[in-house]
Every structure is written in structure tokens, then in C-alpha cells.
């Protein structure tokens, strides 16, 4: 009955602080409404990074002020997190909920370790 | 005879392509001459990155054209690898050999996964 969620073990943010990864879930049923949440786990503390609910076949829309963007294709969600700094390095967990129709299912990935390196500032132009 | 060698699991190179890590070995005897080798494992291929032999209490000297530098303190070697690019991301293994006096011991660490992100080029100054 458990829903399997797969995500990569490690991802590197690029030098602009953008990290992308795919979250894939094995849907036990024909879900039409899906909610995807990205959680960050540091020590034993878990916090929400962003979340979006979408109708299957439609676009994934995060809130305007969200640091996440994403697209969906079948049972795959392509997630992008931006504005990352070195201090944001950590484990990012993908949580998927099949909200409708019944039954409800929840699946949690093992997490993607995102590494972020702050860039060196460019020299001032004289 | 086997000798235990410890090294961190993961290290991030900084934005200038420099990565540092400590390689620590549990010396079974009173070695006076030690050789440290850094190996890179990609797929199943292992290549030598750099190597240095040093006398206990003396400085660690790599060849002039080596991309490695290091210092030693007791049974710890502080290794720095420079000039790294994103394509150099991989598993870097620390190998320690106690060359003298007998008996000879060799120890190999589990490897340090070094992640390297290429920086964005700075904009041209007009």
C-alpha cells in the first residue's frame, strides 16, 4: 500500500545557487490531484521549503514568492530550487500526496543532499 | 599488514577549485618514513593524483608541478588539491604506506567524494 518516491541522492547547485532534481512517484492509483512538498531536514528538524498542488496534466504552480519552480510529466516532477547559499546545503526531501480521488496516499523520498558553494565575488572593474 | 586510514566522506571544493581534507592513519608502529598517495577512482579506473614521502616530524613535500600540497602532524596529513574543475568531481582515496622501519604497512581510506562546481565567468569590464 505504501507509495514509493524516488529522488537522486546528491545534486550540486550551480554557481548561481540553482539546483534541480527529479522526484518520481509510483502511483498506486489514478490520481487527478497531487500535492508535492519539498522539505529540508537539518539535524532532526524538518521545515517546508515549498509546496504545490496540481491537477494531473496541468502545470505545477508554486506561490509567486516561492523559491521553487517545477514542471510535471506523468508521475515525474522536475523541481528547481533557486536562491541557494552555502548555508542552505542540506537534505531536501520530496513528499508526494495523492489528494484525490480516494484513497489518499503519501510517499516520502529518501532525500537529495544538495551541496551549495558560494561564488567568489568578481573583482571590481577600475 | 592492514592499517586503518580515515578520511571524510564528502568535501566541497571552493569556488576557486581548491579542496582540502584530512587523512588520518592508525600507525601500528613507530614509523619514521611515510608515503602518502592520493588516488582518484572514476568508474573502476584508479589513477594517481599525487604522492609524497616524508620523514616523521618533517614537512610533506610534493613535486613542484603537483596539484597537491600538504602538511603533517603526528598521524594526520592535511591534504589540499588545487586547480579542480567540475569534471574532476570524483572519489579521492588516501593511501598511506609506512616505509621504514620494518615491518611495512599499507592502509587505504574509503575515499572522499570531492564535488567541484565551475564558477560563472565574471562579466567583462567595459
Amino acid at each position: 500500500k505504501a507509495m514509493h518516491v524516488a529522488q537522486p541522492a546528491v545534486v550540486l547547485a550551480n554557481s548561481r545557487g540553482i539546483a534541480s532534481f527529479v522526484c518520481e512517484y509510483a502511483s498506486p492509483g489514478k490520481a487527478t490531484e497531487v500535492r508535492v512538498t519539498v522539505l529540508r531536514q537539518a539535524d532532526s528538524q524538518v521545515t517546508e521549503v515549498c509546496a504545490a498542488t496540481y491537477m494531473m496534466g496541468n502545470e505545477l504552480t508554486f506561490l509567486d514568492d516561492s523559491i521553487c519552480t517545477g514542471t510535471s510529466s506523468g508521475n515525474q516532477v522536475n523541481l528547481t530550487i533557486q536562491g541557494l547559499r552555502a548555508m542552505d546545503t542540506g537534505l531536501y526531501i520530496c513528499k508526494v500526496e495523492l489528494m484525490y480521488p480516494p484513497p489518499y496516499y503519501m510517499g516520502i523520498g529518501n532525500g537529495t543532499q544538495i551541496y551549495v558553494i558560494d561564488p567568489e565575488p568578481c573583482p571590481d572593474s577600475d | 599488514k592492514a592499517m586503518h586510514v580515515a578520511q571524510p566522506a564528502v568535501v566541497l571544493a571552493n569556488s576557486r577549485g581548491i579542496a582540502s581534507f584530512v587523512c588520518e592513519y592508525a600507525s601500528p608502529g613507530k614509523a619514521t618514513e611515510v608515503r602518502v598517495t592520493v588516488l582518484r577512482q572514476a568508474d573502476s579506473q584508479v589513477t594517481e593524483v599525487c604522492a609524497a614521502t616524508y620523514m616523521m616530524g618533517n614537512e610533506l613535500t610534493f613535486l613542484d608541478d603537483s596539484i597537491c600540497t600538504g602538511t603533517s602532524s603526528g598521524n594526520q596529513v592535511n591534504l589540499t588539491i588545487q586547480g579542480l574543475r567540475a569534471m574532476d568531481t570524483g572519489l579521492y582515496i588516501c593511501k598511506v604506506e609506512l616505509m621504514y622501519p620494518p615491518p611495512y604497512y599499507m592502509g587505504i581510506g574509503n575515499g572522499t567524494q570531492i564535488y567541484v562546481i565551475d564558477p560563472e565567468p565574471c562579466p567583462d569590464s567595459d
Epitope: 505504501a2 514509493h4 500535492r35 524538518v46 513528499k95 503519501m106 516520502i108 | -
Partner: antibody
């Protein structure tokens, strides 16, 4: 700190209605799904109903389906349970519970007792 | 519906002893979706373990969880006086959310 406070319990006759409330504080209420769980005197825990973040999705235990309605007002940080056509077997302590980020019920209210008796 | 069966119904032990509580599911439950709760008389349940083996915030390390598939265990390594209570397992991976019938840990 996180707090859930239930109210609205009491003694009611079979066939009548009752509305329970759960006031939430100390967290962003709209970011969490919520549940009602009940416990009959001397018995174990029984899940009753669930509501999604925005209140659009609701699930019920078979034992209360068609009689109970869960709702939420995110602007008031309050969860509700409307109980109609009450039966003697609905007698229980009713707890509201928050779903933690990873799924378990991480915070519970102190409970409110509903007694259905003629 | 996933039915959870706990055993034993009652466990009579002395402080300092080790308690082993079992929870068996009627079908496979992902270990990420199994929790344990503690309930004392007159109190609400309290989350102890989630994801089969992760301790909730503030829970002492004498409590540990293990298992996968259909068989899960809660272990209390050395019973303290405050540990005598009723313990429930729960699955939360799919609706309907279900609880075991509980195991009472009482003082011998």
C-alpha cells in the same frame, strides 16, 4: 509553541447534533493537514476524519461517513467537526491532531468528551 | 484497509526491565509510514517514534523502533516509572489511517 485546544463537547441525545471546534496556535495552520481521532471510554484510538490544507479534500472513517463533516477556517486557525445523527457508539473523547511534515500525528489537543445518551 | 495487530495486550514488567512491543500489519507498510504513540491515563497520545525508527523531538533514547514490511517493534531498553502507559502503533501512508488496539505496559 504549538497548541491545539478542542471545545464543544457535552452530553447530547441520540439523533441530535453537536459541533466541535479545535483552535490552533503557534504554527502556520494552513500549511498542515488535520485530523479528528476519537477514543471511546476504556478503548483504543480510532481515526475519524481528515482534511487537506485548503479544505478541498476530506476523508472519513466508514463509521461516520454521511453523518460527520470536517471543515476548517484558515483565516481563524480553526478546525471543526459537525456531528449529526449522533449514536450511543459515538460517545468518546474527540481529539484534533496535526499531521507532521513526514506524516505522523505530531501534536494533539487535550480532547473534548462527547456523551450520547438519552 | 490496513489492520494493525499489537501484542501482547498487556505487558507486566518491573522498572529497569526491557519492554518489547510488537505491531503486525495485515499488509506491507513502508517503514517510512509507521509511528508509535504513548498514552497515559487522562492524557492525549504523544508521538514517540515515526518512520518506524526515528525518535520524535524530546523522546529519550531508551525508546527505539525497528522493523519493516509487516512486522514492527517498539523497544524500551530500561523501563522508568513514567513509561508505564498504553502504547499504540499507527500507519499513515494511506487512508484510512489506522491504529493498533494498543499494548498496556503495567507495573509487575
Amino acid at each position: 509553541q504549538v497548541q491545539l485546544v478542542e471545545s464543544g463537547g457535552g452530553v447530547v441525545q441520540p439523533g441530535r447534533s453537536l459541533r466541535l471546534s479545535c483552535a490552533a496556535s503557534g504554527f502556520t495552520f494552513s500549511s498542515y493537514t488535520m485530523h479528528w481521532v476519537r477514543q471511546a471510554p476504556g478503548k483504543g484510538l480510532e481515526w475519524v476524519t481528515f482534511i487537506s490544507y485548503d479544505g478541498n479534500n476530506k476523508y472519513y472513517a466508514d463509521s461516520v461517513k454521511g453523518r460527520f463533516t470536517i471543515s476548517r477556517d484558515n483565516s481563524k486557525n480553526t478546525l471543526y467537526l459537525q456531528m449529526n445523527s449522533l449514536r450511543a457508539e459515538d460517545t468518546a473523547i474527540y481529539y484534533c491532531a496535526r499531521t507532521g511534515w513526514l506524516g505522523p500525528f505530531d501534536y494533539w489537543g487535550q480532547g473534548t468528551l462527547v456523551t450520547v445518551s438519552s | 484497509e490496513i489492520v494493525l495487530t499489537q501484542s501482547p495486550g498487556t505487558l507486566s514488567l518491573s522498572p529497569g526491565e526491557r519492554a518489547t512491543l510488537s505491531c503486525r500489519a495485515s499488509q506491507s507498510v513502508g517503514s517510512s509510514y509507521l509511528a508509535w504513540y504513548q498514552q497515559k491515563p487522562g492524557q492525549a497520545p504523544r508521538l514517540l517514534i515515526y518512520g518506524a525508527f526515528s525518535r520524535a523531538t524530546g523522546i529519550p533514547d531508551r525508546f527505539s523502533g525497528s522493523g519493516s514490511g509487516t512486522d514492527f517493534t517498539l523497544t524500551i531498553s530500561r523501563l522508568e516509572p513514567e513509561d508505564f502507559a498504553v502504547y499504540y502503533c499507527q500507519q499513515y501512508g494511506s487512508s484510512p489511517w489506522t491504529f493498533g488496539q494498543g499494548t498496556k505496559v503495567e507495573i509487575k
